[in-house]
Structures are given as C-alpha cells and as structure tokens.
Interface confidence: medium
Amino acid sequence: VEVQVSEDPVVALVDTDATLRCSFSPEPGFSLAQLNLIWQLTDTKQLVHSFTEGRDQGSAYSNRTALFPDLLVQGNASLRLQRVRVTDEGSYTCFVSIQDFDSAAVSLQVAAPYSKPSMTLEPNKDLRPGNMVTITCSSYQGYPEAEVFWKDGQGVPLTGNVTTSQMANERGLFDVHSVLRVVLGANGTYSCLVRNPVLQQDAHGSVTITGQPLTF
C-alpha cells in the first residue's frame, strides 16, 4: 500500500476546521475490515485518531478529530481537525496498514490575522517641528509572529529607532507593539505595516501630523 499526503503545509485559521489529506490506493476486493489506520503526532507519537478492526475508534485528541467514514473504502484516510488551536500546529503522520504498511507526514501551519493597528502618540499635544515623539503601533491576536515595517509619507522605510516586541497570550496568539521614535518635521505621515508572514496579510495603520489636530 502506498500512502500519499500533500507536500505543502496545510494552513488553517484559528477556530476554523482543517482537513489533513491522506490517501491510499485500495486493491480490488478491499474491505474496511482489512484496514488499520492511525493518525498520530509525528514528534511525540501521541495517538490522534484511529480506525481498526473494521470500526472508527474515535478521537484520542481532545475530541476534535474525525475521519470521513463514507470515503474510507475509496482510499480517503483524511483527518478533519475541528476548531483549530495554536497548539495543534505541527506534523501529523498518517499510518495505513492493510496487508503491508506505509506512512507519510503532513504539516499543519496555524495562522490568525492581525487586527488593524492602533496608533498612539506621546506626547500628543503641543507638538512642534523638531520635537522628539514616540509613535506606538499596536496590533493584536495574530499568529504566527508578525513583521512590522515603518514608512514615512513618501514611502521611505524608517528603520532607525524602532523597537518591536511581541508577546503571546494564553491562547498562543501574539500581540505586537512597535515603537518608533522620530523627530517631527513641519508635517508628516508615519505609517506602520503589520505583516502576517504565513497569510501574507498586511494590516496598516498611520498617523498624520499637520500641526493640529492629529489624524489617525
């Protein structure tokens, strides 16, 4: 028996369902009574789901997995993972045994989009050209870690005096805070771009300083 899986990682959004595809080519006369199917975590060998002795043995992984029972006889051994969490990320191995045995691993990459950045300015009043200001760009609840880029109103990258920090919350999602320290010109726009490298998703925030008032 030959097991086939996708070579590319499966990308799943947090809180959505994901399908880890795995297939085999059944011989003529194949019956499910002959099939032993095991899904496990590749690194830890922890059992995730199994089908043995002609029946679905169910989920051994937080009761969020399912097979496609009507498709098994056609060689579809795919696994459905429900309500994906950050902690589900990793490699899953599909083992199929009929008369002989084969296995293959498929990677699950979890992702979550970042929120539209909020911009704060310190100080936020009585601003004059030549003043040093601190602009903070904050974006929340994304995964994996973001990349943050700053640009001025002409689109020129601002790379000096930038400090970016990221912290995971209890769900494993990241909040990112990027601080730009800059000397004000007569007027100017400062924008930050928060990029999710998996989703190739960009979230933009900007602040325009034109004397008074400020525009966010």
Partner: antibody
Framework: EVQLLESGGDLVQPGGSLRLSCAAS????????MSWVRQAPGKGLEWVSG?????????YYADSVKGRFTVSRDNSKNTLYLQMNSLRAEDTAVYYC??????????????WGQGTTVTVSS | EIVLTQSPATLSVSPGERATFSCRAS??????LAWYQQKPGQAPRLLIF???TRATDIPDRFSGSGSGTDFTLTISSLQSEDFAVYYC??????????FGGGTKVEIK
Amino acid sequence: EVQLLESGGDLVQPGGSLRLSCAASGFNFSSYWMSWVRQAPGKGLEWVSGISISYGGNAYYADSVKGRFTVSRDNSKNTLYLQMNSLRAEDTAVYYCGRDRSPYQYRSMDVWGQGTTVTVSS
Amino acid sequence: EIVLTQSPATLSVSPGERATFSCRASQTIGNKLAWYQQKPGQAPRLLIFSASTRATDIPDRFSGSGSGTDFTLTISSLQSEDFAVYYCQQYNNWPPLTFGGGTKVEIK
C-alpha cells in the same frame, strides 16, 4: 544534510570591525528565521540578533549590541551575516548561527553551526 | 525582558541515576520554553521544545514538563554521554530571546 557553517571570526582591536558569515545548506534557507547566539569564555548562551524572512528580513537585536551590530541575509547565496562595529572586550565570544525549528516564526533553534571565535583585545 | 533562572547551577549525579533540574521564568511564558544540551567545545543541541515535546532523535529518557513560570527537565537514567550543561530558553516574549544561566551535570 542540513548544515550551518560560520566563518569570519578573528582577533580584533577594541573599536574595530568584523563581519561574520554563516553559510546554510540542505534546507530552504529563505523560509527560515535565523539567529546569532554568542557564548563568552566560560559563560552561558546569549541571543545577539535575529532576522525574519519577509522583504529581505526584519532585524532584531539584544540591547547590548543595538546600534553596533547589523544582521542581514542574502537568500540567493543562502548566507546569513553579522556586521560587528565598535567592538568591545565584552564582545569576545564564540558566535553561533542558529536556524529556527519552524518556518515563519521565532521558536527554538534546531540547527546550529560549529561556531566562530571573536576575540577583542589590544 | 524575561529572566530565566536555572537551578541548581551544578548537579552531581551517578550514571544510571535520575536527574531533575529547574527553570523558572520571571513572568508567565505559557509553554514557550526549550531545553538545550551543550558539551564542551560543541554547539548547543535542541532537546525539548514547547516545554515537553522531544526534538527529533532525542532519546525518551529526556522529558520536559511545566507551564507558566515553572519548568523541569528530567533525565530518567543518566548515561555517560549526558554529562553536559543544560540551558533553557524562552520564546514567548521577544526580543530578546532569553536563555537561563545553565545547569552543569557532572559525574558524582
């Protein structure tokens, strides 16, 4: 075989400059975040700098080297660099490059080079 | 910056014995902790990630546990090749990535 190979370590005077290189092979270099980690003689490990993958890489630094060291990468050459300026005696260490365990993020480093020695002394 | 404190600094153990050492974080880091082994003159080697998952080809005598601020690395039965320095590293809040000061495991 997945491999990282550092080079460029040398004896340099305080205030001097040095450029370290880390040549990667056996994996898709452009998909992995990379780090430099150093170890002073008889001391523990200290993360120095890291670089991400998008747009040629966002750079991150430890406070102790910020403004003096610059990390960069050339994905076409599968090479990571560390430009070290205004070197101080306390920068004396073995410098390792490390590959992150998983693409797209900082996690833990599962592939390390053998290290290159930087000595700052007059 | 998250500070990781490892204890003890040195652990004297006989081959075949169990070794347990600790890593404490200055603030909660969930399960975002790794353990490395380093032998003299060698680069570090990843043992454990996500606090408890063994890296590829790491023997099952190595196990990690803990979450939040308190973590433990256990070697169930020390082999001669296990005498080394062990470091923990957090990746929950960065930059910087931070390492603990290390625990040296020496032969009793």
